[in-house]
């Protein structure tokens, strides 16, 4: 799995609702895959991590300046939906066939 | 400023383009303000953070799972332009007034 | 090597017409603002007008003496500016360089040549 | 319009010693942080030629006894150690807005 060391990349996260407490009102699925973006933004930085010019910025004056300013980050930089089960207001079982921005679809130097 | 204690915001951040060695291109402005977002992305995360549902989810899995997964990140979420005058390849000063993505509008948890 | 060369000037009459061009070498052409700057005798240096690129339109400004009177063109084609000069004055004789550049600066300059309005 | 001003109209200095033209704009010319600045070399019957950009970067092959300083309204030519090829009217001029303008010029002459 990737860590601290390794160059950002999306890993899996399996969340189950039961645990984030949103088995309340989502009745399925019971888990999902989330994914997470991992690692480091390393200089220098790839194109596969698509890096804004800011974050270009950034990770070169971290370069110069490492204890004054930090690397960019490993985020979300795209998302997918999932579809759920959920009950409604009055209780009732409804499909959300896309439920938005539930997913990681890629991660990125931000 | 804002350390790793504070929430996620917007924080000062000049860079001297001789700094990052891109004084080789860009003629002017010898520095600029980047801005750096900075802070922790700690539940329950504000409205201003503008969180993604996957940041909330990854959030509440950190607090069930604090050595498994990581909290959302405090990143860049808006990017705006700045202007900068630049040698073409027939070492012509031309101005560019949209160069975009080098300083921080807004600062999010993603 | 840059090279901006203009077309011949010469004597024309206050009310008269006359069209200057200027053919241009050594660079992209289509990549620069071309510009007129004007000198009369023995004076400093005037701003007449500029003409931009295909993808600003090629928008064109003018100084306000000239507005109205002057046309500035370009034909990319033929890597060429043009300057047409209608209602000619007396106050309009000098020197017209043709010059190339960016949104900055005046990079590329011509010899010039020297327009005369007199009766 | 943005009026910009040189002093002095003409300057005689000996060879070998500091030459220094001044250039006032009416309003700031300085934007994002850059100065719309720039000043030009005239040699007699010849066309202008770009000396200064950005009120203090050398243009392309010119001498480093040139420089330029300033920013906002107040700006300064300096020719560190005149040579007599320089014997020129020279200009200012900012890009600011148009109308591009120029100042009247200064002659420089030696002594």
């Known amino acids: 799995s990737a860590g601290a060391g390794s160059h950002c990349q999306k890993t899996s996260l399996r969340v189950n609702f039961e645990d984030i407490g949103w088995d309340s009102w989502i009745i399925a699925p019971k888990e999902y895959e989330a994914y997470e973006c991992k690692g480091g933004c390393f200089f220098p930085l790839a194109d596969d991590v698509t890096p804004t010019k800011h974050a270009i910025v950034q990770t070169l004056v971290h370069l110069k300046f490492p204890t004054k300013v930090g690397k960019a980050c490993c985020v979300p930089t795209k998302l997918s939906p999932i579809s759920v089960l959920y009950k409604d207001d009055m209780g009732v079982p409804t499909l959300k066939y896309h439920y938005e921005g539930m997913s990681v679809a890629e991660c990125g130097c931000r | 400023s804002a350390g790793a204690g504070s929430h996620c915001q917007k924080t000062s951040l000049r860079v001297n383009f001789e700094d990052i060695g891109w004084d080789s291109w860009i003629i002017a402005p010898k520095e600029y303000e980047a801005y750096e977002c900075k802070g922790g992305c700690f539940f329950p995360l504000a409205d201003d953070v503008t969180p993604t549902k996957h940041a909330i989810v990854q959030t509440l899995v950190h607090l069930k799972f604090p050595t498994k997964v990581g909290k959302a990140c405090c990143v860049p979420t808006k990017l705006s332009p700045i202007s900068v005058l630049y040698k073409d390849d027939m070492g012509v000063p031309t101005l560019k007034y949209h160069y975009e993505g080098m300083s921080v509008a807004e600062c999010g948890c993603r | 090597e840059v090279q901006l060369v203009e077309s011949r000037g010469g004597l024309v009459q206050p009310g008269g017409s006359m069209r200057l061009s200027c053919a241009a070498s050594g660079f992209t052409f289509s990549n620069y603002w071309m510009n007129w700057v004007r000198q009369a005798p023995g004076k400093g240096l005037e701003w007449v007008a500029h003409?931009?690129?295909?993808?600003?339109?090629?928008?064109?400004h003018y100084a306000e003496s000239v507005r109205g009177r002057f046309t500035i063109s370009r034909d990319d084609s033929k890597s060429s500016v043009y300057l047409q000069m209608n209602s000619l004055k007396t106050e309009d004789t000098g020197i017209y360089y043709c010059?190339?550049?960016?949104?900055?600066?005046?990079?590329?300059w011509g010899q010039g040549t020297l327009v005369t309005v007199s009766s | 319009d943005i009026v910009m001003t040189q002093s002095p109209d003409s300057l005689a200095v000996s060879l070998g010693e500091r030459a220094t033209i001044n250039c006032r704009a009416s309003e700031s010319v300085d934007n994002y942080g850059i100065s719309f600045m720039n000043w030009y070399q005239q040699k007699p019957g010849q066309p202008p030629k770009l000396l200064i950009y950005a009120a203090s970067n050398q243009g392309s092959g010119v001498p480093d006894r040139f420089s330029g300083s300033g920013s906002g309204t107040d700006f300064t030519l300096t020719i560190s150690s005149l040579q007599a090829e320089d014997v020129a009217v020279y200009y200012c001029q900012q890009s600011k807005e148009v109308p591009w303008t120029f100042g009247q010029g200064t002659k420089l002459e030696i002594k």
């Open positions: 003409i931009r690129l295909k993808s600003d339109n090629y928008a064109t």
């Open positions: 010059t190339g550049g960016s949104n900055y600066v005046f990079a590329f």
